[in-house]
Interface confidence: low
Amino acid sequence: SASDYNSSELKTACRKHELYVSFQDLGWQDWIIAPKGYAANYCDGECSFPLNAHMNATNHAIVQTLVHLMNPEYVPKPCCAPTKLNAISVLYFDDNSNVILKKYRNMVVRACGCH
Amino acid sequence: SASDYNSSELKTACRKHELYVSFQDLGWQDWIIAPKGYAANYCDGECSFPLNAHMNATNHAIVQTLVHLMNPEYVPKPCCAPTKLNAISVLYFDDNSNVILKKYRNMVVRACGCH
């Protein structure tokens, strides 16, 4: 279940996970011509003390991790979020049925970190 | 408890929360001369469908929210993370007991968003 999802015991350290997204699954196939989908990926995992170098933690995340250790019910751990995102080019129909080629920023997760 | 912390029922939408951090509480008072602490703040809250404009969501976060709706046990919701961070200046002793004034980047959360 979704609540199980959040239990720390099941989680590994913050990292990038592979995820292919089909535009048909999102219900966008009627306006997106190409591509049919793309490797979006996502970030997930624990940001627990100590934060290792590969977790790309900000200074704030390091501070927050320490505060969380002292006040776990008040301050959450930092969260595992994208640190590098790439664009993709999409060919689609606009509202007037014109075909448009547009670059959409921040669509693909390249790297994750604790924030 | 910490696990209760993560249950969606208790959470409001992603936003900035105020948090003052005392360096003494972190055990850093022996090397940090000034300031004694600072307003670090933190991000917390739900990134649920639909993502409102004030949630500063990336395109990827919008896609991930939709994928989560279809596969809540496989793909998490985007997480609430800092979108704007500020630096603070810290006066501290280095290993040779020299006093150093240094600007530490990404120490203060100015704004949060869904990532």
């Epitope: - | 022996d30 006066l91 002793f93 007991s97 020299n98 006093v99 004034l101």
Partner: nanobody, 117 residues
Framework: EVQLVESGGGLVQAGGSLRLSCAAS????????MAWYRQAPGKQREWVAT??????LYGDSVKGRFTGSRDNAKNTVYLQMNSLKPEDTAVYYC????????????WGQGTQVTVSS
């Protein structure tokens, strides 16, 4: 033993200026950091500024109005206070921290600053 003596306090009108001095004497080993604090009646002690050989840091309430400096030869630090406001009224203390100390080891007796509107 180290002694700290503040001077320069007084009564001034809002918008005016004062210059506080804090002279340290005694067996000072590596005069590292000297801080200014203030305490208004019924309020907690508030950090104002820290003057060291590495630079000066200021509290948010005085940033841009107060300037800290030091004269190493005289073991003295100064606090130039401009654009004073009634809320700056307090007893101002200086404190000295030496190398390796976990806090400020020595405090002055304080000097009264009163800003009238």
């Amino acid at each position: 033993e180290v002694q700290l003596v503040e001077s320069g306090g007084g009564l001034v009108q809002a918008g005016g200026s004062l210059r506080l001095s804090c002279a340290a004497s005694g067996s000072i080993r590596g005069f590292v950091a000297m801080a200014w604090y203030r305490q208004a009646p019924g309020k907690q002690r508030e950090w104002v500024a820290t003057v060291t050989n590495g630079g000066t840091l200021y509290g948010d309430s005085v940033k841009g109005r107060f300037t800290g400096s030091r004269d190493n030869a005289k073991n003295t630090v100064y606090l130039q206070m401009n654009s004073l406001k009634p809320e700056d009224t307090a007893v101002y203390y200086c404190a000295l921290r030496q190398i390796g100390a976990s806090g400020y080891d020595y405090w002055g007796q304080g000097t009264q600053v009163t800003v009238s509107s």
